[in-house]
């Protein structure tokens, strides 16, 4: 399975608006997502968009909206004004750089037959989203938690004797039954063949931003969110060399100014392996 | 036509530097990193680092630690190559290369300079 | 660092020959790429991502593999193939090449 997935859908309410969304199912760190239109970027595409997950976001007409949607995915709003609506027929590409390991890219359109609403397949179509997976899973958990609560209290409403009271212990098993799928589904949604993996590693650590980004507009928004985000994250001192566990190791310049927390984080570090991922193109 | 085109021959005293250039033509320059491989006199490929032309920042081989500085000019689209306290075993071919994108569909393709020869000698 | 090693060192086969050329890796790598290079002339891209041919390379050329042992497969030998190939990892920096295997003329 490609590693890149894209998806183009057309608005219910408004036919002249689309949205691409993009995702990187390897593990990795992204430094970089590029969206063009007409072709790959680099060969015949037209940049829409480019997404830095520390430095903002850039984005040309028709592009109206680029944001990320989870630490390995993002959504481009586009605004058609032409009648014949031409995004139809276009081909949107997206392209995830985990510098310096490689750029990874993918293109997908909208197929003729679309309704509007209705989303066209990823491409590739993953059998089941590993984050819907995981939700769906946490969500079965909770109901079957709660019912056996539910159930446990009724059986002590008609009893005497307060023997079988839920115990302490038991909530907490329900407590980790309940967390578990949570990590699960974080650790697949990056790497669907992973084991679950909690630890976190710096995203961008290994690099130099000497310049080229600091005209960006920077919004704490674009900081990727989730469970990643609210994670206490290792505080690092800047030091002119910085060794990571996984033996990455480069140059750490100065990083220009940005709002939202100093690094972001990727819950999908693991190890030495943890950098180029299963990039096969069928 | 993409082209890297490198410096020419250079002839450097031990503790010297030496700056190699590599000159990108035929594509947008920002639109690819550019790696810098060394190869010794009748040895094997090795990694030196990337840079990243669009904004700079640079990735090194830990084994050049302090001793190697890439940088890049996008008003002549090129890239440069220092290294410093030159030792006799620096002495090697040094190749540019255009990164490859791994593009689904897509013709994938990398592109490399000429080669540029440093010799270290005393 | 991630040490390749290929096997053999030299292989001499004939041209129409079926050739075989390993790349063994010190640890677990995702992905391995191969690249020929003639003598006096810089390297080239054969296979990118373990068995995907880069763009114009012959269909002779194959790659295969996971973890730690790569194959590159030419499967019937021309007379423009004798060269040295290398392996490429970069699964974990710094990146690596193996010390080459030389393919000649028998």
């Known amino acids: 399975t490609p590693e890149v997935w894209v998806q183009v859908q057309m608005e219910a309410t408004e036919l002249s608006s689309f949205t691409v969304h993009c995702g990187f199912l390897g593990p990795g760190s992204i430094s970089l997502v590029t969206v063009s239109w007409g072709g790959p970027d680099g060969a015949g595409g037209t940049k829409l968009a480019v997404l830095h997950p520390e430095l903002g976001t850039r984005q040309w007409a028709p592009a109206r909206q680029a944001r990320w949607e989870t630490q390995s995915s993002i959504s481009l709003a586009l605004e058609d004004s032409g009648a014949s609506s031409p995004f139809a027929n276009t081909t949107f590409c997206c392209k995830f750089a985990s510098f310096p390991e490689g750029s990874w890219e993918s293109c997908g359109s909208l197929p003729p037959s679309s309704d509007p609403g209705l989303s066209a397949p990823p491409t590739p179509v993953p059998i089941l989203r590993a984050d819907l997976a995981g939700i769906l899973g946490l969500s079965g958990v909770l109901l079957f938690g709660c019912g056996y609560l539910l159930h446990l209290l009724r059986r002590q409403k008609h009893r005497p004797t307060p023997r079988l009271q839920p115990s302490h212990t038991n909530s907490q098993a329900l407590t980790a039954q309940a967390w578990a799928p949570s990590q699960a589904s974080q650790a697949a949604l990056h790497d669907p063949y992973a084991t679950i993996n909690t630890s976190f590693c710096p995203a961008t650590l290994d690099t130099a931003h000497p310049n080229g980004w600091a005209s960006l507009p920077t919004h704490a928004a674009h900081q990727p969110q989730g469970p990643a985000a609210s994670a206490s994250t290792p505080i690092l001192a800047r030091g002119s060399f910085v060794s990571v566990e996984n033996g990455l190791y480069t140059q750490a310049g100065e990083r220009p100014p940005h709002t939202g927390p100093g690094l972001t984080l990727f819950p999908d570090c693991r190890g030495p392996r943890a950098v180029e991922g299963r990039f096969g193109v069928r | 036509e993409v082209q890297l085109v490198q410096s020419g021959a250079e002839v450097k005293k031990p503790g010297a530097s030496v700056k190699v250039s590599c000159k990108a033509s035929?594509?947008?320059?920002?639109?690819?990193?550019i790696y810098w491989v060394r190869q010794a006199p009748g040895q094997g490929l090795e990694w030196m680092g990337t840079?990243?032309?669009?904004?700079?920042?640079?990735s090194y081989n830990q084994k050049f630690r302090g001793r190697v500085t890439m940088t890049r000019d996008t008003s002549t689209s090129t890239v440069y190559m220092e290294l410093s306290s030159l030792r006799s075993e620096d002495t090697a071919v040094y190749y540019c290369?255009?990164?490859?994108?791994?593009?689904?569909?897509?013709?994938?393709?990398?592109?490399w300079g000429q080669g540029t020869l440093v010799t270290v000698s005393s | 660092q991630i040490v390749l090693t290929q096997s053999p060192a030299t292989l001499s086969l004939s041209p129409g020959e079926r050739a075989t050329l390993s790349c063994s890796a010190g640890?677990?790598?995702?992905?391995m790429h191969w690249f020929q290079q003639k003598p006096g002339q810089a390297p080239r891209l054969l296979i990118y991502?373990?068995?995907n041919l880069a763009s114009g390379v012959p269909a002779r050329f194959s790659g295969s593999g996971s973890g730690t042992d790569y194959t590159l497969t030419i499967s019937s030998l021309e007379p423009e193939d004798f060269a040295v190939y290398y392996c490429?990892?970069?699964?974990?920096?710094?990146?690596?090449f193996g010390q080459g295997t030389k393919l000649e003329i028998k």
């Open positions: 490429q990892q970069r699964s974990s920096l710094p990146f690596t």
């Open positions: 991502s373990t068995s």
């Open positions: 640890s677990s790598v995702n992905y």
């Open positions: 840079i990243d032309t669009s904004d700079a920042k640079t």
């Open positions: 290369a255009r990164d490859f994108i791994i593009t689904v569909n897509y013709p994938v393709v990398d592109y």
């Open positions: 035929g594509y947008t320059f920002t639109d690819y990193w």
